[in-house]
């Protein structure tokens, strides 16, 4: 931002009215007047080129300094070409003199030379020959100097002639100011340049009303330079939640917009399933029946708990499950759904009935399911089992109520034995299986079944309460089909699978190898 | 309106003392540095004195310098011409002026002239 | 020199312009003001500065300078323009503060 000027003294907007003091009175310099577009301009100027030893001073009137610490003077001159006069007039100048004196006091027609300090010497940039002088041509220049720190309470400025011929339009002196500014939504007091070149001025902003400094960042900083200018900003605030940048300034957000947080963002329209925000809204409350969890940004719409899992089938396989089951038909809006599944199980004869999660085996831990089957095993038999899938998501833990589906199946059968070859001969085959452990009290024999590969003719059974048996004045070499089914109280078990076991060669005889 | 009105010539023999007083009226005395002018009978005109503003500066023309004081009173608006030791050669009609801006003038306001006649 | 020097006399027929001339090395330093004055009556200010006329001054009166001379020009000069005219200026030698050009009798024929 450009730097302001105040201005302590105007010489040119004073109209002649300022009456500085000349020295030595009425022989050097002078104020005189001219009119140019019926306006009268006022000089004070002086041209004895053609007397040597010329001193001639004019002293400003006193200026108050204020808060002023470094001036800068302005001045507007005219000087004539020394070769204007005859013999180039050997006294004559072509410069003259800028002093200055503080004083906490005007000292009025006293005027004492030696308290002054000399400023510089003014030269012109361009001088006025007698031509151009004869028409009314004259070369106007612009010089600036500028001094500081100043400490007393004003001051005075001097002009020396020492043999120049020289009018003086302008004598403007004023101090600097960085402007009154806002950006980045910080407001920056006016403030007084500096009186040191290579110094800044550090000023801290205000955020404007509604604005904040952003967590962690930092407070707004901006350095006033000598020259009223605004350098290297450091910071910015921010518009608070409910606010948004308008110019440089918060602006409430609109009915029917909001914004959550500090943020350079602007407001935002409720999303989705959200009740129509007041004016300066942080966020949007949901509609009656949606929800918005704790994790979900204020931009989401609200959302509702997901229905029941669309479909459940329950397969039963021997002591085995597999629940299957398609995604909820509404998902309340969301993709984060997960699925429970709990067991019950009935005995049929009593009535009774209690969770079986202790008791039976999941393909995978039944909740935060996310794909939509799983295997239940370890299913006892003869036992009426209900399977219960509940969907949910992020929000279901909002409400009370829960969306499941349930499917009940009733195991009529013990799961099949595994069946393993424990060794042969020529002769033997030893067999053994297992069930899993809840199964097996319920067992009261096993029955084994086998026959000859290729002969559906015969087959021999042979029953035993243990988990193997050697069958025993087999043919040699021949491959026979074994099949191990539990017997309860209720009626025969599933079967196992029927495998092909085959006897040794008589080669190999006499060895009972696996 | 704005006029200086002059007062206190006469006959006055070699060697006395005169006072001429100026009255200003209609513009603020105190802004302006004053003059006397004189005319002997059938010359042109000669610059005598002048006094700055505020009474501080003033500065005589060597005919006169030493014998005659300019003077003034703001408060009264008026200027005066201390005239001593006269001589024949002071016989003049005196005018007081202002100068318009500055020390040196233009002069822009004259008075009516007053005339001193210096003869035994 | 501290001296301004004008012709004694000029004289100008009726409408006709009429130029009096200042002589000086004042005037190469400081601009000439212009005074008229009738007889039994104060000067009155015609010219100041580079070419200045106060209110009430005809404009058939102008100033103008170069180098040492300063003029007066009366651009169809009228019967109560008889009278004598003066030029003033600062005195740039020290010697005086202002000085006065000896006066110039115009007649109108």
């Known amino acids: 931002a450009q730097g302001k000027e105040v201005v302590l003294l105007d010489f040119a907007a004073a109209g002649g009215e300022l009456g500085w003091l000349t020295h030595p009175y009425g022989k050097g310099w002078d104020l005189m007047q001219n009119i140019m577009n019926d306006m009268p301009i006022y000089m004070y100027s002086v041209c004895n080129v053609m007397s040597g030893d010329q001193d001639n001073w004019l002293r400003t009137n006193w200026v108050y300094r204020g808060e002023a610490e470094r001036i800068f003077i302005e001045l507007k001159f005219t000087v004539r070409d020394c070769n204007s006069f005859p013999g180039g007039a050997s006294s004559c100048k072509e410069t003259f003199n800028l002093y200055y004196a503080e004083s906490d006091l005007d000292y009025g027609t006293n005027f004492q030379k030696r308290l002054f300090t000399k400023i510089d010497t003014i030269a012109p940039d361009e001088i006025t020959v007698s031509s151009d002088f004869e028409a009314r041509h004259v070369k106007l220049n612009v010089e600036e100097r500028s001094v500081g720190p100043l400490t007393r309470k004003g001051f005075y400025l001097a002009f020396q002639d020492i043999g120049a011929c020289v009018a003086l339009l302008s004598v403007r002196v004023y101090y600097k100011k960085c402007p009154e500014l806002l950006q980045g939504l910080a407001h920056f007091p006016e403030t007084i340049a500096g009186s040191d070149a290579p110094s800044l001025a550090t000023v801290a902003g205000t955020c404007v009303d509604h604005a904040v400094v952003p967590p962690g960042g930092e407070e707004p900083r901006m350095h006033c330079a000598v020259d009223g200018e605004w350098l290297v900003p450091i910071g910015q605030c921010l518009c608070q939640a409910g606010y948004e940048k308008v110019e440089d300034a918060c602006q409430a957000c609109s009915p029917g917009f909001f914004k959550f947080e500090a943020s350079e963002s602007p407001c935002l329209e409720c999303p989705e399933h959200t009740l129509p925000s007041p004016e300066g809204a942080t966020s949007c409350e949901c509609e009656e029946g949606f929800f918005r969890a704790p994790q979900d940004p204020a931009s989401m719409p609200c959302t509702r708990p997901p229905s029941a899992p669309h479909y459940l089938t329950a397969v039963g396989m021997g002591a085995k499950v597999e629940l299957r089951w398609t995604p909820p038909q509404d998902s309340g809006g969301r993709e984060d759904i997960v699925y429970s599944v709990t067991c019950e199980q009935c005995w049929p004869e009593s009535g009774e009935c209690g969770p079986c999660e202790a008791s039976v085996r999941y393909s995978e831990p039944p909740h935060g399911l996310t794909r939509t089957s799983v295997t239940v095993s370890d299913l006892e038999p003869h036992m009426n089992y209900t399977f219960t899938v509940e969907a949910r998501n992020g929000v279901s833990g909002l409400v009370t109520s829960r969306s499941f589906r349930t499917a009940s199946v009733s195991i009529n059968q013990t799961e099949p034995p595994k069946v393993r070859l424990e060794g042969r001969s020529t002769t033997s085959l030893s067999v053994s299986w297992s069930i899993p452990p809840p199964q097996q009290s319920r067992v009261w024999k096993y029955e084994v079944t086998y026959r000859k590969k290729g002969d559906s003719n015969s087959y021999n059974v042979r029953r035993t309460e243990g988990f193997s048996v050697t069958l025993d004045d087999l043919a040699p070499d021949t491959t026979y089909l074994v099949q191990v089914q539990a017997l309860t109280q209720e009626g025969q078990g599933a079967g196992s699978k029927v495998h092909e076991f085959q006897t040794l060669s008589p080669e190999g005889s006499g060895n009972l190898a696996v | 309106q704005v006029q200086l009105v002059q007062s206190g010539g006469g006959l006055v023999q070699p060697g006395g003392s005169l006072r001429l007083s100026c009255a200003a009226s209609?513009?603020?005395?105190?802004?302006?540095?004053m003059h006397w002018v004189r005319q002997a009978p059938g010359k042109g005109l000669e610059w005598v004195t002048v006094i700055s503003h505020d009474g501080t500066n003033t500065y005589y023309a060597d005919s006169v310098k030493g014998r005659f004081t300019i003077s003034r009173d703001n408060s009264k608006n008026t200027l005066y011409l201390q005239m001593n030791s006269l001589r024949a050669e002071d016989t003049a009609v005196y005018y007081c002026?202002?100068?318009?801006?500055?020390?040196?003038?233009?002069?822009?306001?004259w008075g009516q002239g007053t005339l001193v006649t210096v003869s035994s | 020199s501290s001296e301004l020097t004008q012709p004694p006399s000029v004289s100008v027929a009726p409408g006709q312009t009429v130029t009096i001339t200042c002589q000086g090395d004042s005037l190469r330093s400081y601009y000439a003001s212009w005074y008229q004055q009738k007889p039994g009556t104060a000067p009155k200010l015609l010219i100041y500065g580079e070419n200045n006329r106060p209110s009430g001054v005809p404009d058939r009166f102008s100033g103008s300078s170069s180098g040492t001379s300063a003029s007066l020009t009366i651009t169809g000069a009228q019967a109560e323009d008889e009278a004598d005219y003066y030029c003033n200026s600062r005195d740039s030698s020290g010697t005086h503060l202002t000085v006065f050009g000896g006066g110039t009798k115009l007649t109108v024929l």
């Open positions: 002026a202002r100068a318009s801006v500055g020390a040196t003038g233009p002069f822009d306001i």
């Open positions: 209609g513009f603020t005395f105190s802004s302006y540095a």
